[in-house]
């Protein structure tokens, strides 16, 4: 058993049918010695008396808010949560496996640049009685500071019969140098509590591996005289690291017909302009990627050919 | 990534082309190592990230873009004198560069070159003959060092009398390649920045 926060405790259980469970001793936080009784949740049934209460925690029915009283007055509370270990592996019931970029990916994180700011998100089908708390650091043995905000519900989607909820959090490394070469990964730890179930999820990454630039901005077309060709131009996104001559991007320019089946013409360039043939009803899209370290491509920025 | 490669103009900052070749070569070598050594811990998540140049060179600090010198977090041990030799910089660009930058890059390359050559000698003794260092990568390191044209005493190749542990050597190869790829990215950024200056 360990303390998650004041008066909230996590009991770790080897989870299998007929398991013996864990013996837990609760102590009433009071100078009183006599006349103390214990109850669980809203029940008025007295579970025991005395300054300490010994319980065998086996299942969720044994978890909850234990309260010690004296003469009708509440003295203190202890909330017991359960953390299930199923055959040596901690349970992952609360969050959905996003399966991207690989199986057992519960937390996904992205950064728009090298400033040390990043966003993580996760999915669940649970709508109520759910709380999250997020901590992060650079490295784990001698951790350096990363400050995270509160996790917020960022999207709701309908997936078949189920509703899916996306939560996200923004974090910022306290003293980040955009040009630094990372040797210790960022660690992100999410505590999830659903009713009386506790779970924790972690992700470990280098900022350089989660970079996804914003799409190029100010995408414009300039027709070339007496030609079907157009000059496409664009700019670096505002959120990208500066100076751009140091943090350079490379670009992919795509001409896509109205139908998805039509052949796509693609050109790669390090410049912020390109000359392409604009077909009728086609659209021109441009996306960006770090020129020197191949992390994710940005989403496409698009303009119609006409 | 298989992108069309632009040929640099003759007037272009001469080291840029070499640094681009270096990044391409080390990235290819790392990819090859990860595929060949699939049963070894060779992915970024599995290896210890060690920097053999740590406390010996200061490339990131010495080559920091001027715009980032205002960032407190970037100023660990920054040297501020300006470059006075090295053939990569035309004289009119000299003032844009700090003294230690190119020599620090040169020292990095020299240290990695020695490590890679020592390691290759060990890998050649492996009866499995599983993996060797790409000669192209070693040649590209050499070309960039020559383009940097710094005079420094040659570091003797380390020779080891004890029987090599091939498992450990292959893991060390992965560690070295990951670190060298990161340094090659920094070198490319620096060369690109200098070219634009």
């Amino acid at each position: 058993i360990w303390e998650l926060k004041k008066d909230v405790y996590v009991v770790e259980l080897d989870w299998y049918p007929d398991a013996p469970g864990e013996m837990v001793v609760l102590t009433c936080d009071t100078p009183e010695e006599d006349g103390i009784t214990w109850t669980l949740d809203q029940s008025s049934e007295v579970l025991g008396s005395g300054k300490t209460l010994t319980i065998q925690v086996k299942e969720f029915g044994d978890a909850g808010q234990y309260t010690c009283h004296k003469g009708g007055e509440v003295l203190s509370h202890s909330l017991l949560l359960l953390h299930k270990k199923e055959d040596g592996i901690w349970s992952t019931d609360i969050l959905k496996d996003q399966k991207e970029p690989k199986n057992k990916t519960f937390l996904r994180c992205e950064a728009k640049n090298y400033s040390g700011r990043f966003t993580c998100w996760w999915l669940t089908t649970i709508s109520t009685d759910l709380t999250f708390s997020v901590k992060s650091s650079r490295g784990s043995s001698d951790p350096q500071g990363v400050t995270c905000g509160a996790a917020t519900l960022s999207a709701e989607r309908v997936r078949g019969d189920n509703k899916e909820y996306e939560y996200s959090v923004e974090c910022q490394e306290d003293s980040a140098c955009p040009a630094a070469e990372e040797s210790l990964p960022i660690e992100v730890m999410v505590d999830a509590v659903h009713k009386l179930k506790y779970e924790n999820y972690t992700s470990s990454f280098f900022i350089r591996d989660i970079i996804k630039p914003d799409p190029p901005k100010n995408l414009q077309l300039k027709p070339l005289k007496n030609s079907r060709q157009v000059e496409v131009s664009w700019e670096y996104p505002d959120t990208w690291s500066t100076p751009h001559s140091y943090f350079s991007l490379t670009f992919c320019v795509q001409v896509q017909g109205k139908s998805k089946r039509e052949k796509k013409d693609r050109v790669f360039t390090d410049k912020t302009s390109a000359t392409v043939i604009c077909r009728k009803n086609a659209s021109i899209s441009v996306r960006a990627q770090d020129r020197y370290y191949s992390s994710s491509w940005s989403e496409w920025a698009s303009v119609p050919c006409s | 990534r298989n992108l069309p490669v632009a040929t640099p103009d003759p007037g272009m900052f001469p080291c840029l082309h070499h640094s681009q070749n270096l990044l391409r070569a080390v990235s290819n070598m790392l990819q090859k190592a990860r595929q060949t050594l699939e049963f070894y811990p060779c992915t970024s998540e599995e290896i210890d990230h060690e920097d053999i140049t740590k406390d010996k060179t200061s490339t990131v600090e010495a080559c920091l873009p001027l715009e980032l010198t205002k960032n407190e977090s970037c100023l660990n041990s920054r040297e501020t004198s300006f470059i006075t030799n090295g053939s990569c910089l035309a004289s009119r660009k000299t003032s844009f560069m700090m003294a230690l930058c190119l020599s620090s890059i040169y020292e990095d390359l020299k240290m990695y070159q020695v490590e890679f050559k020592t390691m290759n000698a060990k890998l050649l003794m492996d009866p499995k003959r599983q993996i060797f260092l790409d000669q192209n990568m070693l040649a590209v390191i050499d070309e960039l060092m020559q383009a940097l044209n710094f005079n420094s005493e040659t570091v003797p190749q380390k020779s080891s009398l004890e029987e090599p542990d091939f498992y450990k050597t292959k893991i060390k190869l992965c560690i070295l390649l990951h670190a060298f790829r990161i340094r090659a990215v920094t070198i490319d950024r620096v060369m690109s920045y200098l070219n634009a200056s």
Partner: antibody
């Protein structure tokens, strides 16, 4: 004590269907994940499928994906394996089993796919 | 498509020490715990070892398990006639959990 009693096995022609049941008692069935494991005659153990305690997630071996469906009825304390488009290579003893460090197995039920 | 490899058979005379190996990889045994089962003819498998080296109550102490890196082993110290059976190791793969990964199985024969 924990008990898993299996039923539903038998002889079936290729391409036909069969449903296996596993009745649980002696524990809170709705709190635990459950597996199906099979063993072809003279061969080793092969995992078939898993279902979470609440039925929310199901996992299958590639060899049965799209043909077999694992399900549970927590109100009846019963686990099921619906087998469709049966093939000769599905001939095996099928076991249900609890998930956890200490597990409990059903007695096994023989499924023979033969024309 | 077994990923955990065991020797097909091992044998010993009563009283001898018999060991069975189970060889896997970084993503399975290297990252997860190992179980060992005993299966007597015509019966369901019986758990002998869980969490690499833990014995459930009721399992004789002549059975012991260990794990090192990407392989595990089961030892029967002082093998007895009633130990003649098939033995299977089991683990998980970190990418496909909760799918059970079973070993190829080992037939233990007690001679004499």
């Amino acid at each position: 004590q924990v008990q898993l009693v299996q039923s539903g096995g038998g002889v079936v022609q290729p391409g036909r269907s069969l449903r296996l049941s596993c009745a649980a008692s002696g524990f809170t069935f709705s709190s635990y994940g459950m597996h199906w494991v099979r063993q072809a005659p003279g061969k080793g153990l092969e995992w078939v499928a898993f279902i979470r305690y609440d039925g929310s997630n199901k996992y299958y071996a590639d060899s049965v994906k799209g043909r077999f469906t694992i399900s549970r009825d927590n109100s009846k304390n019963t686990l099921y394996l619906q087998m469709k488009s049966l093939r000769a290579e599905d001939t095996a003893v099928y076991y249900c089993k609890t998930h956890g460090s200490h597990d409990n197995w059903g007695q096994g039920t023989m499924v023979t796919v033969s024309s | 498509s077994y990923v955990l490899t065991q020797p097909p058979s091992v044998s010993g005379t009563p009283g001898q020490r018999v060991t069975i190996s189970c060889s896997g990889g970084r993503s399975n045994i290297g990252s997860n715990t190992v179980k060992w089962y005993q299966q007597l003819p015509g019966t369901a498998p019986k758990l002998l070892i869980y969490h690499n080296d833990q014995r459930p109550s009721g399992v004789p102490d002549r059975f012991s398990g260990s794990k090192s890196g990407t392989s595990a082993s089961l030892a029967i110290t002082g093998v007895q006639a009633e130990d003649e059976a098939d033995y299977y190791c089991q683990s998980y793969d970190r990418g496909t959990h909760p799918a059970l990964l079973f070993g190829t199985g080992t037939k233990v024969t007690v001679l004499g």
